[in-house]
Amino acid sequence: SSVRTWSPNSAVNPHTVPPACPEPQGCYLELEFLYPLVPESLTIWVTFVSTDWDSSGAVNDIKLLAVSGKNISLGPQNVFCDVPLTIRLWDVGEEVYGIQIYTLDEHLEIDAAMLTSTADTPLCLQCKPLKYKVVRDPPLQMDVASILHLNRKFVDMDLNLGSVYQYWVITISGTEESEPSPAVTYIHGSGYCGDGIIQKDQGEQCDDMNKINGDGCSLFCRQEVSFNCIDEPSRCYFHDGDGVCEEFEQKTSIKDCGVYTPQGFLDQWASNASVSHQDQQCPGWVIIGQPAASQVCRTKVIDLSEGISQHAWYPCTISYPYSQLAQTTFWLRAYFSQPMVAAAVIVHLVTDGTYYGDQKQETISVQLLDTKDQSHDLGLHVLSCRNNPLIIPVVHDLSQPFYHSQAVRVSFSSPLVAISGVALRSFDNFDPVTLSSCQRGETYSPAEQSCVHFACEK
């Protein structure tokens, strides 16, 4: 646990039992801000959550402490270590001076909290532009103007060939100075990120002579997702969706290359479907066949009625608030024309069920249905547009006979999930069920996908 974070057990000797944070309220951290203000959002950085809690129960309430004396409860929040929790506070409408973060997880670590004001807050009227200071090791000469005002370019003229230099940038606001930025190391006379030459030995994948993210070659000279860079200096182009299936994008670009099927496997898309909730606005049959390549997965969508139902099924007959209160379960069954031994199930999303009001990720429960109508549970899986399509591997219990799967059942609890396709991935030219049925004196022929008689040549 870092000295820069707060945790319920941070004050406790590591050799003693950490304090419990008993239900219903648990432990809480109270933070006060320098200036009371009408908030637009609250951001909290969490650096550790116990695995027992996952993301869902660690923060069981956040209270805003209003100047009026009112405590405004924001309720339970889902927290993650890789993304700060941001809560929009559009309807608070009164000055807040502090917060209380309640937790049932004695190991939870909180690094920072930031209250952002609404626009045109009187506190910001006196704000001055930020200044920047460049620091070097070895130090710059005293007479070098290392403080930058409105221009953001610093030229160092005092360099010796072959010498190693490290640079940091410090932000200055009024009389306050920030922590130094991460260092950049430069050997005078050798290449660097931004010189237009790709130094592979320094980990550069591209160099477009600038330090801008989002143009295909990142600030650290790394090639960005969905871009391809060629030549020196690098010229980068956005290849995903340009209609040309290039070799390097076969595994990643559904738009250009269709769904990637690894060698030795066969992907079968649903040939029929049945769903729990449908009407003329959201028919279940749209998930039959391969998903439309043009569909990009969208997150935090609350109105799915615009242009989704032609490409994907979602349970449009039930509103989001209703489904939450009624705890409705939605399901779809995808049927496949050729029952096979499943290697994986592939689920294509158009929306991942996330709701802008919280950070909870939706999960789906997946089952395989075999030709004897037996169900085989593949467990719960988290949905995310970052991980789309969702590929669920099928692990076979080798102490049990193999089975042919004829359908997949997917169930979930949010009407904000839209599914555009379901595939059954099986082994190409290899059927374990048939293989295991070969008699003595027979061998499995991949070409004929059946057992064939063989005789040993002596």
């Epitope: 606005q281 609350i302 009625s305 449009c316 509103s319 608030p321 209160l325 009001g357």
Partner: antibody, heavy 123, light 107 residues
């Protein structure tokens, strides 16, 4: 027929609490949701929250979070709405309204309304 | 919160007239819109749910249409008992919100 009968008018002092009841008849109480809505004089209707009368699950408008509590007594087929820390702005007519079926919704909206309970907050 | 804006805020009409009231949501609400009628001193009455479905017992002169953000309530031939205030309400997201109301008055 389906009917919702609410408790009588209340006069309260600022800082006090009020509890309004809503007795349902003519349908299976636990199969439906119950909304609470208020209307201040000359103002638009304002949704406060709702309860799944079967499970007791609730959801409140953030504006009232921490001040409002919606409960139900299934044996009496009655829903309750309690509002605490009353202030003069809470002077309004408070309505309960039956929401959709929690089992198989065929209709949405607030189908049936109580007659309303006038709550006056004054020092 | 989703803001619901009704227009006009009031309309003067005669018996037999066709009256149209519009309701605009600040963001898409799919089909989840209801219309209510309220008379002075009375509780509101549900007319239409899910944009266009007529509540049981409501006369067929009332109809609703729209999707996404723009919705309409139409009274095809105004009757004496229709003079009242009409509210739209979204139930696509929390908190459920109502429009400011449209008062239909006798010309």
């Amino acid at each position: 027929q389906v009917q919702l009968v609410q408790s009588g008018a209340e006069v309260k002092k600022p800082g006090a609490s009020v509890k309004v009841s809503c007795k349902a008849s003519g349908y299976t109480f636990t199969s439906y949701a119950m909304h609470w809505v208020r209307q201040a004089p000359g103002q638009r209707l304002e949704w406060m929250g709702w309860i799944n009368a079967g499970t007791g699950a609730t959801k409140y408008a953030r504006k009232f979070q921490g001040r409002v509590t919606i409960t139900r007594d299934t044996s009496a087929s009655t829903a309750y709405m309690e509002l605490s820390s009353l202030r003069s702005e809470d002077t309004a007519v408070y309505y309960c309204a039956r929401g959709p079926s929690m089992e198989t919704p065929t209709t949405y909206g607030m189908e049936v309304w109580g007659q309303g309970t006038t709550v006056t907050v004054s020092s | 919160d989703i803001q619901m804006t009704q227009s006009p805020s009031s309309v003067s009409a005669s018996v037999g007239d066709r009256v149209t009231i519009t309701c605009r949501a600040s963001q898409g609400i799919s089909r989840w819109l209801a219309w209510y009628q309220q008379k002075p001193g009375k509780a509101p009455k549900l007319l239409i749910y899910s944009t266009s479905s007529l509540q049981l017992g409501v006369p067929s002169r009332f109809s609703g249409s729209g999707s996404g953000t723009d919705f309409t309530l139409t009274i095809s031939s105004l009757q004496p008992e229709d003079f009242a205030t009409y509210y739209c309400q979204q139930e696509n997201d929390y908190p459920f919100t109502f429009g400011g109301g449209t008062k239909v008055e006798i010309k």
